[in-house]
Interface confidence: low
């Protein structure tokens, strides 16, 4: 299953597969996630070694038992890959780090006025992985604002290095905020010239693209079919880059197939896995497994399950098969693709969906990075969990935020029902950032369900929590996923970086704001939280937020909204925005409902009809 | 919307020439490999040439090689068949159409045809 | 070039009925197989790509099949309806040089 639990001071020892330079144990986490063999990780920070050539060690590592013992290591940070994690795999990673020179291949500098403007330039520019910049206050004048665009052989940076006044970040390309726009088409009978980077053997052009598109140097490929000429380069997958980003030359020839890296495609990504299955293919590699199972479709949950498992073939020569079920051969090799693809057999093939992200009903959601009264503009895909519950009648209006909490499922405060119980009125925008790009065309969820909690009473603060169950189930992607929910009862973490997002008045008599606003505001506890509201109850299940000064909170319109804390890069949906007097005064935190108090509540209501759960918080 | 638009077609002599345009809307046209495709009066379809997204490789059915030209100008979002040393049996309407966005995909896309009559 | 052969050249049939076309390859062409329909006066449309992928906004009752040869295919129409009746063509793309089938004409009975 999934393992999202980080070691702290911990290394595990052996079972190494690759290392490389990464800035944190997050970003080592997505390099391992994406690995084809790599289970579990260790990442040395700055700070917890000597060893210059070590710092921001990353080291991804493979164990057959799925387990390795860990060392004591002060400073290290180890986890586990996040394949069969669903909605939480993602190659989508915003940090900027401050600070850090991440070094690689520079190629292009330009002056710009922000790290901002740096990362955005190096999304759009098809060759760039990573950048560093020096700000205003770099040492050396004639440095500073300079843009250093950079990209090295494996995609991570040949050497991090402390620097003061550099900050350095990745291209936001996986997150699909590439400007490029990309080719979607591939060519018949047509074959790529220039440098090749990469060669696997796939069944079809389609899987050649995909593996082209999360290798962090291919930007097009030349795929060879089953009935080229050359019988030793059947099925070769040939991953490709050149100078310019295109290919210099094409040349027409039969049995051969080419296209283009989707990375650069705007507003959606193809998931890193592949979900067909090819019959009459078998795929060879080494043996991991042999399992008697009945069918094709229940071989590859097998696969997908043995989180070692990269793909398989089912057999259905008489020899291996006894009753209704089949020898179901379940393989793995160094670069994740068959080392052998055979046609015209008894047999079906394809891929493990370890990395398939949209996975099962799982909460837990990814590491991605309120109006709001001193907020600021959120981007695209920062909080992909956030919805916008707009009320139809004869004019159409945005009332309440909400939180995406599994495909079918958003969580928000039963106050936004209040006098508008009927869910026929209720319109469900997910997915935006803009409320002004909202169309007559613009497609949104409708309500199957409004679940308000059995104690909550109109006008009281209490149980202010209610669940929308959608008519349809959404799609996940970069820009519409859920937020993790927090374990039951939560109340020993400390969390340190809190956000509420919305678009609700950005002062007390203002009005709804276009632009999803984000603020950060601290946690207060309930004790100070009460010496504040005198008047009114703080319970327990409840959460307090805001600065004794005031100046930044949630508002009219945020109300259902998400206040989320990062911990362990990961997102959490602490509180639900709920009520508060005034917006953003002197010692008056936002009140939120305390979600970790609710999750039996929650956990009930979302069974399923089967009764199986339709969202776990993490492990 | 996909729109191709064939014009220049027209009454021609034997040996003579004429030039076929389409004009491409409403896709990304330096993207796309298109093709020239023909039917004589009341026959079936022929394919005539292609020519891929970049203006480079082209090829030819043997009943036009050496007589026809297939070109693009990607900048007009145009393409083009310089057909000369026509014969009776060029007589056709001739479409234009776009290769589709997929492996093995046929073409997705056509126009509305322009017919070509050679004919003294 | 590619030969491709299709049977029958014409055929009569009444709405509602099924209709199966045969399509013949002079060599394997794997799955580089694609149907279009065609009515008088009008540019053909694309049915079928890859043997059996339906073309976005086709019917569903047009189903596209194939044998493991290569050299096969079938177009078969589960239910004949009035908008059907028309001339269908079959097409390989696994050579550059794409050829056609001479085109079969379904017509009312």
């Known amino acids: 299953g999934c393992l999202t639990q980080l070691y702290e001071n911990a290394f595990f020892r052996g079972g190494d597969v690759a290392s490389m330079y990464t800035p944190n144990a997050q970003y080592c986490q997505m390099r391992c996630t994406f690995h084809p063999r790599c289970l579990l990780f260790s990442f040395l920070p700055a700070s917890s070694i000597n060893d210059m050539e070590k710092r921001f060690g990353c080291f991804l590592k493979d164990s057959v038992t799925g387990t390795l013992p860990k060392v004591h290591r002060t400073g290290a940070v180890s986890g586990h890959s996040l394949k069969q994690c669903g909605h939480q795999i993602s190659a989508c990673h915003r940090d900027i780090y401050k600070g850090v020179d991440m070094r690689g291949v520079n190629f292009n500098v330009s002056k710009v006025s922000s790290v901002e403007e740096c990362q955005k330039r190096c999304t759009s520019n098809i060759r760039c992985q990573f950048f560093s910049y020096a700000t205003q206050t770099f040492h050396k004048a004639e440095y500073r604002n300079n843009c250093l665009l950079k990209y090295s052989p494996g995609g991570t940076p040949t050497a991090i290095k402390v620097l003061s006044n550099v900050e350095s970040g990745f291209s936001l390309k996986p997150c699909a905020l590439s400007e490029i726009g990309c080719h979607m088409n591939i060519f018949q009978h047509l074959a790529f010239s220039d440098v090749d980077v990469a060669r696997v053997l796939t069944p079809d052009a389609f899987v050649c693209r995909t593996i082209c598109t999360y290798h962090p140097n291919c930007l097009f490929f030349t795929f060879y079919t089953n009935v080229w000429k050359i019988e030793s380069q059947r099925n070769v997958c040939l991953l490709k880059t050149s100078e310019s980003g295109t290919p210099s030359s094409s040349t027409p020839q039969e049995n051969t197939i080419s296209g283009y890296s989707l990375l650069t495609c705007k507003r959606t990504l193809p998931e890193p896995c592949h979900s067909k299955i090819y019959p009459g293919v078998d795929f060879g590699g080494e043996e991991l497994n042999v399992t008697f199972v009945k069918g094709v479709n229940v071989c590859q949950e097998t696969c997908t399950k043995m989180i070692r498992c990269q793909f398989f073939t089912y057999s259905l020569l008489p020899e291996d098969c006894k009753e209704e079920k089949c020898k179901c051969f379940l393989r793995l090799s160094m670069d994740g693709s068959p080392t052998r693809i055979a046609y015209g057999t008894q047999g079906s093939s394809g891929y493990s969906l370890r990395l398939c992200n949209t996975g099962d009903n799982s909460v837990c959601t990814t590491k991605t990075s309120t109006r709001i009264v001193g907020g600021t503009n959120s981007s695209w895909g920062e909080w992909p969990w956030q919805v916008s519950l707009q009320v139809k009648l004869t004019a159409q209006r945005h009332l309440c935020g909400g939180s995406l909490i599994g495909h079918q499922w958003v969580l928000t405060a039963a106050h936004c029902f209040d006098g508008l119980p009927l869910q026929d009125v209720w319109r469900i925008y997910s997915g935006i950032l803009n409320l002004s790009d909202i169309t007559k065309d613009t497609p949104f969820s409708q309500i199957k369900e409004i679940i308000i909690h059995q104690n909550y009473k109109v006008s009281e603060g209490n149980h202010d929590i209610a669940l929308i169950k959608l008519q349809a189930p959404l799609n996940y992607t970069e820009f519409q996923k859920p937020i993790c929910l927090p374990s039951k009862g939560d109340t020993s973490t400390i969390y340190t970086n809190c956000w509420v997002t919305g678009w609700g008045f950005s002062k007390e008599k203002g009005e709804i704001q276009n632009i999803l606003q984000k603020v950060n505001i601290p946690l207060v506890t309930n004790e100070e939280c009460q010496k504040r509201y005198q008047d009114y109850k703080i319970t327990q299940r409840m959460v307090c937020a805001g600065y004794k000064e005031g100046g930044k909170d949630a508002c009219k319109g945020d109300s259902g909204g998400p206040l989320v804390c990062k911990h362990n890069g990961m997102w959490r949906l602490v509180g639900i925005t709920s009520w508060g007097e005034g917006c953003a005064r002197r010692e008056q935190p936002g009140v939120y409902t305390k979600v970790a108090e609710y999750m039996d509540w929650i956990l009930e209501k979302t069974q399923s009809s089967d009764g199986k759960a339709q969202m776990q918080s993490p492990a | 919307e996909v729109q191709l638009l064939e014009s220049g077609g027209g009454l021609v002599q034997p040996g003579g020439s004429l030039r076929l345009s389409c004009a491409a809307s409403?896709?990304?046209?330096?993207?796309?490999?298109m093709h020239w495709v023909r039917q004589a009066p009341g026959k079936g379809l022929e394919w005539v040439s292609v020519?891929?997204?970049?203006?480079?490789?082209?090829s030819y059915a043997d009943s036009v090689k050496g007589r026809f030209t297939i070109s693009r100008d990607n900048s007009k979002n145009t393409l083009y068949l310089q057909m000369n040393s026509l014969r009776a049996e060029d007589t056709a309407t001739y479409y234009c159409?776009?290769?589709?966005?997929?492996?093995?995909?046929?073409?997705?896309?056509w126009g509305q045809g322009t017919l070509v009559t050679v004919s003294s | 070039d590619i030969q491709m052969t299709q049977s029958p050249s014409s055929l009569s049939a009444s709405v509602g009925d099924r209709v199966t076309i045969t399509c013949r390859a002079s060599?394997?062409?794997?799955?580089?197989l694609n149907w279009y329909q065609q009515k008088p006066g009008r540019a053909p449309k694309l049915l079928i790509y890859?043997?059996?992928?339906?073309q976005s906004g086709v019917p569903s009752r047009f189903v596209g099949g194939g044998s493991g040869s290569g050299t096969h295919f079938t177009l078969t129409i589960s239910s004949l309806q009035p908008e059907d009746f028309a001339t269908y063509y079959c097409?390989?793309?696994?050579?550059?040089?794409?050829?056609f089938g001479q085109g079969t004409k379904v017509e009312i009975k």
């Open positions: 159409a776009r290769d589709g966005s997929g492996s093995y995909l046929g073409f997705d896309y």
């Open positions: 409403g896709f990304t046209f330096s993207w796309y490999t």
């Open positions: 020519i891929y997204p970049s203006g480079g490789p082209t």
């Open positions: 060599q394997s062409i794997a799955t580089y």
């Open positions: 890859a043997a059996s992928s339906l």
């Open positions: 097409q390989q793309s696994y050579s550059t040089r794409e050829t």
